[in-house]
């Protein structure tokens, strides 16, 4: 069980990174002059609390910017949205924190992450570029809800 | 109006089981985390353990572990403590109650009125 | 196991400000022990303060707040009313269970 968030990049199988503008991630073309946002990653530690077989539950931050992912309903649709967090507070809780979890699941080099709050939505990005992450009941079709991570350092 | 219900005092012998329920109302039991509490006179209370009723994954306190058994049934709202083996020390009030976060916490916001569990024979 | 110590009674003032403290056996008090302050009033009438060391639950009134204080969790009343006379319990976290103190008996007169 690590005890130190992991920093990854995340790109979609468009070659999409995911970019931090006015406090909301939206995926863009890599570029040149994109600063992609380093994302931290972080084991539930009571993982054995949780759903088996759904992947490994997992809490999303953005390095270095006390900003984690989480996900709450807005009228009766769950949203994704950005909160301010210590990454290491959540980590540490007494009880899994479901609102700020998703279950990483990975299939050769693709990744899903899946709301623990809200099962059967993923984190998604349009296929339109330079779209909002969103979260969708709907995989492969107007979303794409496969990622690729590489860790870093 | 968020209100969790205890079921009534028991008596019951020495070496008998009783099970023991905490029925919510105001919010879903698959939304949070219900907790048990042990409050015996002039002891404070005691951590029994937790239940997540939405995966039945219940954690308990090693004092209380295999006297203890956590359950929940979600179609009805209600959470449960099942006590075994039963002596004269578990004689005590029993509470159930939600450990829910908000924001940026978790607490044990709402509490039952207790059950009062008398083992005599 | 650890065990959580409580001032056993304590009396305050109406409008004063009092402060209840909560330590710990095992070392210092620590943001990570996760301090929970509940209210005990007659006929086993629990509710929820304070969580997370220093968070106050929703419609809790603000003149309850949690903190560190030196070693110790404090819960401070600050302009005690009446209707706070209670047993106070404060529970600790220890990584994979809860510790209550015994209570601390306020008194407001």
């Known amino acids: 069980k690590s005890e130190m968030p992991q920093p990854v990049s995340i790109q979609d199988i468009n070659h999409r990174v995911w970019v931090l503008q006015d406090q909301i991630l939206i995926a863009v073309p890599r570029k040149d002059r994109v600063s992609p946002v380093t994302i931290s990653l972080i084991s539930c530690r009571h993982v054995e609390t949780l759903e088996k077989d759904r992947g490994n539950p997992i809490y999303l931050g953005l390095n270095g910017l006390n900003l984690c992912l989480m996900c709450a309903k807005a009228g009766d649709q769950p949203t994704l949205q950005l909160k301010e967090k210590d990454i290491m507070d959540l980590y540490n809780q007494p009880e899994p924190v479901k609102s700020f979890l998703f279950y990483h699941s990975q299939s050769g080099r693709n990744s899903t992450f899946e709301s623990v709050a809200f099962p059967g939505w993923f984190i998604a990005v349009s296929s339109e570029g330079g779209c909002p992450l969103i979260l969708t009941q709907e995989l492969g079709k107007a979303n794409t809800t496969d990622f690729g991570l590489t860790m870093l350092f | 109006e968020v209100q969790l219900q205890q079921s009534g005092a028991e008596l019951v012998k020495p070496g008998a089981s009783v099970k023991l329920s905490c029925t919510v109302s105001g919010f879903n039991i698959k939304d949070t985390y219900m907790y048990w509490v042990k409050q015996r006179p002039e002891q404070g209370l005691e951590w029994i353990g937790r239940i997540d009723p939405a995966n039945g994954y219940a954690k308990y306190d090693p004092k209380f572990q295999g006297k203890a058994t956590l359950t929940a049934d979600t179609s009805s709202n209600t959470a449960y403590l099942q006590l075994s083996s039963l002596t004269s020390e578990d004689t005590a009030v029993y509470f159930c109650?939600?450990?829910?976060?908000?924001?940026?916490?978790?607490?044990?916001?709402?509490w039952g009125q207790g059950t009062t569990l008398t083992v005599s024979s | 196991q650890a065990v959580v110590t409580q001032e056993s009674a304590l009396t305050t003032s109406p409008g004063e400000t009092v402060t209840l403290t909560c330590r710990s056996s095992s070392g210092a008090v620590t943001t990570s022990n996760y301090a929970n302050w509940v209210q005990e009033k007659p006929d086993h009438l629990f509710t929820g303060l304070i969580g997370g060391t220093n968070n106050r639950a929703p419609g809790v009134p603000a003149r309850f707040s949690g903190s560190l204080i030196g070693d110790k969790a404090a819960l401070t009343i600050t302009g005690a009313q009446t209707e706070d006379e209670a047993i106070y319990f404060c529970?600790?976290?220890?990584?994979?269970?809860?510790?209550f103190g015994g209570g601390t008996k306020l008194t407001v007169l």
């Open positions: 529970g600790l976290w220890y990584s994979n269970h809860w510790v």
């Open positions: 109650a939600r450990f829910h976060w908000y924001d940026s916490a978790f607490y044990f916001d709402f």
